[in-house]
């Protein structure tokens, strides 16, 4: 485990949480649940009690917001960044964030409360069998009244358990209708209508008549939402599917992933996709928000990231339905505020004690690791020392392994990348990398494991670079790129993410290229790179000799030290000056003898 | 007691530059951000940026993006807002305003009048 | 960028209830929290509710504020001469923030 700098912590055990919104991914009391239930995860090992509030005066308040939400640290879009907390302390600190962008579900797809059928208002289970076929939403297969239900249990056909989903032709929402369904056909502005409408509306909301003429009557309600049935990207983002729809001639009652390779659920938003070709994707499992936060509240009440990836703090997401806290959780947390105190002895009960389940995380399915948030962004010292911005080093005792003499940096024939970060230079190997400060007689330190300090980060490495105002550091594997802000990581992210096309198969090294600019380089082609908005300009693509003459053509790193570009071939460099406006190399040599001043044995 | 205190009242000519300090006391400068809001007379509040004064990050209104420059100097618990190239119509008071899920202080505000 | 549209006027004689309402033009505020400020002449602005509904602490609990699909409302119950001011209601919108125009409450 990891805690901030001068272990930042509450010094009251009384601690008060506000939530100060919400998302429209969950109902409101899956959502409080969620967050209780994650705090008690915390309470249950620590003296700490967590009480709710409705004021912004609580230690901890918690948010959902999209991209720029107020902080300073913008969230990304959907995944990548998840969610962000501060460590603790007045203000800011303590607050937690959650990206609405994601899709927030308990970690086994969208929630979907039921109104009546026999369940007792239980959510959806998805998928569900019924009549020996698999649904992935609501659905009106077997009714003839058009009413959408689903099975609360994982098979209808052996369990008989159902309810029926949020649906207009069952209820409508606030308006001035006090709740009745929807009457299609309605008639407004003369026009007949048989389905929900944003029609005379700015907002985007859907509404529809309860009566057979709305401009007559004037009594209107909002259709409910159907996370279910929503979809995400293709062509009709934020519509519904519309079930049964036809597909290469044949009809669908539920999201298929036939015709496509990647196994993703998608559906048609018409009743015909061969006419009207109209689509999204289906909603998938989405993020646990009760995982999710519990993390988040670990760094709100003090802890940094784990190096244990079985940890609740490691910075990867992974769905789990064991017992969230690991050992190293617990060590971290009592760290801070010692163990829950034993209860009281008390007469003995009559009801026998449930056998409570082995500490340990089992995942249920393959641990896929998702990206994780860029949480815990911000001053590692205590708040007195005013900002420090997030921690650019990392863990300050960074795990040397025991040395043997593949680990001295000299023996390293080729490095996978080498980057100035801050104003040392940093050399990747193999998992490992060296630090070296230039000097008379000095020797690269280490080596240190990249695992301890960047745990994200796969063990080859292509190229890394510092973005010196923001302090960004980006690494480049194959297709993917990880960004750290201090120890807090966003990714993997796909090249293509940052606007590279699909032939670009690696980041062979970067280039400062004025303000909050970068060359990005690849093989032979080079393009210019705005860090800001993390985008190459397509424009920009140039061959790296027309810019930098004299350069091998075959380079595997380029770097830049000293306000000098690098080129790395083999075991060698050609260093390239710039003077009025012209690229010249000065100097070609050893990285080795001539940069790491290692001795010529 | 939680105060924000500007600095005085500037005249500029157009095309001139004006900053304008802001001073916090009374809570812990680095945990909250500093929004600034301006009123031109007899109309109504306009944002014009942001700054944490947490981390430095600034977030400007669309309009006044390479006009305005905001900064903190945690060192004296400071924010500058500076605003360039002055036209007549920037003439307005000058509001910081601490921010935190709503700006619950202001400062008193600085008159900032533009003329030849 | 969003607009938020108030009605630039209100009022009311002393005691009554006077409601001023805050829209969203081109994006949705039902979705996004409000703050509402008061601004009573020659001084800065207050914080007078901030996130829909919630009152710092010495705001008389005849304010109140609401916020369901696309409008947002600022409440003033049982109204009195010192209510006379300027009223902004203030939200997120992508990335910045959005002040209505402003509802000039006089008290009759």
């Known amino acids: 485990f990891q805690t901030f700098e001068g272990d930042l912590k509450w010094h009251h055990h009384n601690i008060t949480y506000w939530i100060q919104n919400y998302s429209e991914d969950l109902p409101r009391a899956v959502i409080d649940d969620a967050f209780a239930r994650a705090f008690a995860l915390w309470s249950a090992v620590t003296p700490l009690t967590f009480t709710r509030v409705y004021s912004r005066d609580a230690d901890i308040v918690i948010q959902f917001g999209v991209a720029e939400h107020g902080d300073g640290y913008p969230f990304d879009g959907k995944d990548g960044l998840l969610a962000h907390a501060f460590p603790p302390g007045p203000g800011i600190q303590g607050d937690a964030h959650f990206d609405d962008d994601e899709l927030w579900s308990l970690g086994k797809g969208v929630v979907v409360p039921t109104r009546f059928g026999n369940a007792d208002g239980a959510a959806c289970h998805f998928p569900f069998i019924f009549e020996g076929r698999s649904y992935s939403a609501c659905t009106t297969d077997g009714r003839s009244d058009g009413l959408p239900w689903c099975s609360t249990t994982a098979n209808y056909d052996t369990d008989d358990r159902f309810g029926f989903c949020p649906s207009e032709r069952l209820y409508t929402q606030d308006g001035n209708a006090d709740g009745k369904p929807c009457q299609f056909p309605f008639i407004f502005q003369g026009q007949s209508y048989s389905a929900c409408t944003t029609d005379g509306r700015s907002d985007g909301y859907r509404w529809c008549a309860t009566t057979a003429n709305y401009d007559r009557d004037k009594l209107f309600g909002f259709c409910p939402t159907r996370a279910d049935s929503t979809v995400m990207g293709g062509n009709s983002a934020g519509e519904l599917c519309v079930f049964p729809f036809t597909f290469l001639g044949k009809e669908y009652s539920t999201c298929t992933s036939e015709g496509r390779g990647d196994g993703r659920l998608w559906c048609a938003t018409t009743s015909n996709f061969d006419s009207d070709k109209k689509w999204g994707f289906c909603p998938d499992q989405g993020y646990s928000l009760f995982l999710v936060a519990a993390h988040e509240f670990g760094h709100a009440l003090g802890l940094d990231h784990s190096s244990v990836p079985e940890a609740l703090m490691y910075p990867m997401y992974r769905f789990t339905e064991g017992p969230p806290l690991h050992k190293d959780d617990v060590n971290g947390i009592r760290h801070l505020y010692g163990p829950r105190p034993e209860p009281e002895p008390r007469p003995p009960t009559t009801t026998t004690p449930q056998p409570t389940a082995p500490p340990t995380v089992c995942p249920t399915g393959p641990p896929t690791v998702h990206p994780s948030e860029r949480p815990t962004a911000g001053p590692t010292g205590p708040p007195s020392a005013g900002p420090t911005g997030p921690p650019t080093a990392g863990p300050s005792t960074a795990t040397t392994v025991p040395l043997s003499p593949v680990d001295d940096a000299c023996n390293v024939n080729i490095f996978d990348a080498i980057a100035e970060i801050g104003n040392q230079l940093y050399l990747f190997k193999d998992g490992k990398y060296w630090r070296f400060s230039e000097g008379r007689g000095s020797r690269p330190q280490g080596p240190f494991l990249i695992a301890d300090k960047w745990p994200a980060l796969p063990r080859k490495l292509d190229s890394v670079f510092e973005e010196r105002l923001s302090k960004k550091l980006f690494f480049f594997s194959g297709r993917q790129v990880w960004v750290y802000t201090g120890a807090s990581v966003l990714g993997p992210r796909r090249l293509d993410k940052l606007g590279l096309g699909a032939d670009v198969a690696q980041v062979t090294g970067a280039l400062r290229s004025g303000r909050g600019k970068m060359l990005l380089f690849s093989g032979r082609r080079l393009w210019r790179f705005d860090v800001k908005a993390q985008m190459v300009d397509p424009r920009s693509a140039s061959e790296v000799d027309r810019m930098f003459p004299g350069v091998p053509l075959d380079t595997h790193d380029v770097f830049q030290y000293r306000e000098k570009a690098y080129f790395c071939q083999d075991r060698f460099y050609w260093r390239v000056s710039s003077r009025s406006e012209l690229n010249q190399v000065d100097q070609v040599g050893y990285v080795t003898y001539d940069i790491l001043q290692c001795p010529e044995d | 007691e939680v105060q924000l205190v500007q600095s005085g009242a500037e005249v500029k000519k157009p095309g001139a530059s004006v900053k304008v300090s802001c001073k916090a006391s009374?809570?812990?400068?680095?945990?909250?951000?500093i929004s600034w809001v301006r009123q031109a007379p007899g109309q109504g509040l306009e944002w014009m940026g942001w700054?944490?004064?947490?981390?430095?990050?600034?977030n400007y209104a669309q309009k006044l993006q390479g006009r305005v420059t905001m900064t903190t100097d945690t060192s004296t618990s400071t924010a500058y807002m500076e605003l360039r190239s002055l036209r007549s119509d920037d003439t307005a008071v000058y509001y910081c305003?601490?921010?935190?899920?709503?700006?619950?202080?202001w400062g008193q505000g600085t008159t900032v009048t533009v003329s030849s | 960028q969003a607009v938020l549209t108030q009605p630039p006027s209100a009022s009311g004689t002393p005691g009554q209830r006077v409601t001023i309402s805050c829209s969203g033009s081109?994006?949705?505020?039902?979705?996004?929290?409000v703050n509402w400020y008061q601004q009573l002449p020659g001084t800065a602005p207050k914080l007078l509710i901030y996130?829909?509904?919630h009152r710092p602490s010495g705001v008389p609990d005849r304010f109140s504020g609401s916020n369901s699909w696309n409008t947002a409302s600022l409440a003033i119950s049982g109204l009195q001469s010192e209510d006379e001011a300027d009223y902004y209601c203030?939200?997120?919108?992508?990335?910045?923030?959005?002040f209505g125009g402003g509802t000039k409450v006089t008290v009759l």
């Open positions: 305003a601490r921010d935190y899920y709503g700006m619950d202080v």
């Open positions: 009374g809570y812990t400068f680095t945990s909250y951000g």
């Open positions: 700054i944490s004064a947490y981390n430095g990050n600034t």
């Open positions: 081109t994006f949705n505020i039902g979705s996004n929290t």
């Open positions: 996130s829909d509904s």
């Open positions: 203030q939200a997120w919108d992508s990335s910045a923030v959005v």
